[in-house]
């Protein structure tokens, strides 16, 4: 191992993956197992993050970089750097203190995470419900009720065929 020669701070020459060992006359010593230093000149190495239980290892710890975790299947990451794991639910459910619970009538969730959201109120946009909502899916809004009055067609007529060489109007 290299004995540092810097006149200012003998530790400044210690590279990432080592620490400046005061117990050994400020020699650069490699980080012990399960620890790392990501920058040079450090006087200690940091303990590697352990990915266990709800976490699983995405990237192993090395002498120069910390381990990275994601979540064990059945859970998903929350927070910066996957600092927490939260339970998945099925579509049509939301997570509560009591675990996964079905969405109440009039609400839906089309994902494995997040909360149940109210169905779209089609009438606010002057439209009618074309497809009813479910616990897993929002309603589909269609034409306004006036457009569906007797004699009115709910099907959009086809656009007139264009002759070759003519640009659309």
């Amino acid at each position: 191992f290299e004995r540092t020669r810097s006149l200012q701070d003998p530790c400044s020459n210690c590279p990432a993956g080592t620490f400046c060992d005061n117990n050994r006359n400020q020699i650069c010593s490699p980080c012990p197992p399960n620890s790392f230093s990501s920058a040079g000149g450090q006087r200690t190495c940091d303990i590697c993050r352990q990915c266990k239980g709800v976490f699983r290892t995405r990237k192993e710890c090395s002498s120069t970089s910390n381990a990275e975790c994601d979540c064990t299947p059945g859970f998903h990451c929350l927070g910066a750097g996957c600092s927490m794991c939260e339970q998945d639910c099925k579509q049509g459910q939301e997570l509560t203190k009591k675990g996964c619970k079905d969405c109440c009538f009039g609400t839906f969730n089309d994902q494995k995470r997040g909360i149940c959201r109210p169905w779209t109120n089609c009438s606010l946009d002057g439209k009618s419900v074309l497809v009813n909502g479910t616990k897993e899916r929002d309603v589909v809004c269609g034409p306004s009720p006036a457009d569906l009055s007797p004699g009115a067609s709910s099907v959009t007529p086809p656009a007139p065929a264009r002759e070759p060489g003519h640009s659309p109007q």
Epitope: V54, F75, L78, G79, S83, M84, C85, K97
Partner: nanobody, 123 residues
Framework: QVQLVESGGGLVQPGGSLRLSCAAS?????NYWMNWVRQAPGKGLEW???????????YYVDSVEGRFTISRDNARNSLYLQMNSLRAEDTAVYYC????????????????SGQGTTVTVSS
């Protein structure tokens, strides 16, 4: 260093009982919701039960309701899971997990868990 260590697992016959323990250290145990989660062989992780900081609220997944009881002793920094009327489908590795800051308010994420203890229910 924050640490959770589970113990108490083992082999038990169907209908039998086990009591799991989780020893917490490195943080103020009484300030956190705590959880038990489990992973059956070849399956995803499943939440089992949780308990509020002071033990005043307890919740369970439907499949263990009435058979399992979660409890805590804040003076001893310990979490427990009393498992009665065990079934083959309870066979799993059981993990103790801490609810992260804001658990129960803005999220239900867990930020620390232990190595797990194995429960095998078989005749």
């Amino acid at each position: 260093q924050v640490q959770l260590v589970e113990s108490g697992g083992g082999l038990v016959q169907p209908g039998g009982s086990l009591r799991l323990s989780c020893a917490a250290s490195g943080f103020t145990f009484s300030n956190y919701w705590m959880n038990w989660v489990r992973q059956a062989p070849g399956k995803g992780l499943e939440w089992v039960a949780n308990i509020k900081e002071d033990g005043s609220e307890k919740y369970y997944v439907d499949s263990v309701e009435g058979r399992f009881t979660i409890s805590r002793d804040n003076a001893r920094n310990s979490l427990y899971l009393q498992m009665n009327s065990l079934r083959a489908e309870d066979t799993a590795v059981y993990y103790c997990a801490r609810g992260g800051e804001g658990y129960g308010d803005s999220h239900y994420g867990m930020d620390v868990s232990g190595q797990g203890t194995t429960v095998t229910v078989s005749s």
